[in-house]
């Protein structure tokens, strides 16, 4: 139930995928990750106006109730709809190992 | 990777399940739903401080980057981790029908 993709707030203001460059130090990983040294972190950022990329019925309800009770019910939030995997070379008790993380990089976004 | 359940902001301030009473009119459903007339909508509301109920690695990254770049990267957001189904009696072209919605009521919450 992915609703409208037209952003009424203007281009790039609504929930979408952004890329943020981060070092291992930024992420607090320097002591356990060897590679990559820098990560292009894809994440979901932006506003979720009425019915914009509503993930499901719950998001639609949230929009309606936020309109009625903005101090009680927050607007839907821009979060990952799916993820891309990422492989890290990480330190282990015995040395180093390749490890795949399935929930690290956002692939696309919706409002919930 | 569900992290700490202790809220550093004080009892009830962090991401958790809330119940909001809503009529069919509130939800904009009055023209297509016959029953129930009122819904106890369970939804996820509250702050997501560092590592509180972090859903996954992405949420942990988001926390780290929000701390570094608060104007660019938002804090993780309180959203449903799972849902309870709900049955509606709804109007159809031929009369009425029972319909189960699996993504309507939040069952529990996490930060992402």
């Amino acid at each position: 139930a992915r609703n409208g993709d037209h952003c009424p707030l203007g281009p790039g203001r609504c929930c979408r995928l952004h890329t943020v460059r981060a070092s291992l130090e930024d992420l607090g990983w320097a002591d356990w990750v060897l590679s990559p040294r820098e990560v292009q972190v894809t994440m979901c950022i932006g506003a979720c106006p009425s019915q914009f990329r509503a993930a499901n019925m719950h998001a639609q309800i949230k929009t309606s109730l936020h309109r009625l009770k903005p101090d009680t019910v927050p607007a839907p939030c821009c979060v990952p709809a799916s993820y891309n995997p990422m492989v890290l070379i990480q330190k282990t008790d015995t040395g180093v190992s390749l490890q795949t993380y399935d929930d690290l990089l956002a692939k696309d976004c919706h409002c919930i | 990777a569900r992290n700490g359940d202790h809220c550093p902001l004080g009892p009830g301030r962090c991401c958790r399940l809330h119940t909001v009473r809503a009529s069919l009119e509130d939800l904009g459903w009055a023209d297509w739903v016959l029953s129930p007339r009122e819904v106890q909508v369970t939804m996820c509301i509250g702050a997501c401080p560092s590592q509180f109920r972090a859903a996954n690695m992405h949420a942990q990254i988001k926390t780290s980057l929000h701390r570094l770049k608060p104007d660019t990267v938002p804090a993780p957001c309180c959203v449903p981790a799972s849902y309870n189904p709900m049955v509606l009696i709804q109007k159809t072209d031929t009369g009425v029908s029972l319909q189960t919605y699996d993504d309507l009521l939040a069952k529990d919450c996490h930060c992402i």
Epitope: L34, S35, P36, R37, N84, P85, M86, V87, L88, I89, T92, D93, T94, G95, V96, S97, L98, Q99, T100, L105 | -
Partner: antibody
């Protein structure tokens, strides 16, 4: 003593399949990644892929689909299943401990002696 | 796909001289690089890992440098036992992981 021993090589017809084994001793496969490498006669080394300590597999693009790496930690053995074999797959196949570009603790250079696979009709 | 390119293909050096071998990666592989020595009929022998760390038991005349896409193996003073084929290996990780060896550099007696 830490050892790696490949077996299962031999003569196979084009289009055939073969499963190579790498029996390890002196360490646990649940703690170490394992790499397969091959070398055609008179040619250079070729990276085939890795199976991680947790069981994830990673392959060279040319190996995806035809080659499968697996392991049985209870038998302390890593396998390389090779399907749809071609003449150009003729090579000595080596297994090695670790991901090779970084060293594990202890012995830094653990390779088997290799097993020869010949693909010919 | 990651591609590792070694140069030169053959290096003719006199014993006691310095040898410099190059390896270039098609992707930024940080320090995910190792150097191996191989002699006929033997498995490869690890010399350098993490681009610049000397493996245990390897003489100090071997050294590695570089990061990102450009790497160098230096043998400061060639001994008779150093005449062999040398390979670099790079591993690239991001959405997946893939490794590749360079085509090798043969170091021969001049």
């Amino acid at each position: 003593e830490v050892q790696l021993l490949e077996s299962g090589g031999g003569l196979v017809q084009p289009g055939g399949s073969l499963r190579l084994s790498c029996a390890v001793s002196g360490f646990s496969l649940s703690s170490y990644d394992m790499t397969w490498v091959r070398q055609a006669p008179g040619k250079g080394l070729e990276w085939i892929g890795i199976i991680s300590s947790s069981g994830n597999t990673y392959y060279a693009s040319w190996a995806k689909g035809r080659f499968t790496i697996s392991k049985d930690s209870s038998k302390n053995t890593v396998y390389l299943q090779m399907n749809s074999l071609r003449a150009e797959d003729t090579a000595v196949y080596f297994c090695a401990r670790g991901i090779l570009v970084y060293a594990d603790y202890g012995d830094h250079n653990l390779w088997g002696q290799g097993t020869l696979v010949t693909v010919s009709s | 796909d990651i591609v590792m390119t070694q140069s030169p293909a053959t290096l003719s050096v006199s014993p006691g001289e310095r040898a410099t071998l190059s390896c270039q990666a098609s992707e930024d592989i940080y320090t995910n690089l190792a150097w191996f020595q191989q002699k006929p009929g033997q498995p490869p022998r690890l010399l350098i890992y993490a681009a610049s760390t000397l493996a245990s038991g390897i003489p100090a005349r071997f050294s590695g440098s570089g990061s990102g896409t450009e790497f160098t193996l230096t043998i400061s003073s060639l001994q008779s036992e150093d005449f062999a084929v040398y390979y670099c290996l790079g591993v690239y990780t991001y959405i997946s992981a893939e490794g590749a060896f360079g085509q090798g550099t043969k170091v021969e007696i001049k």
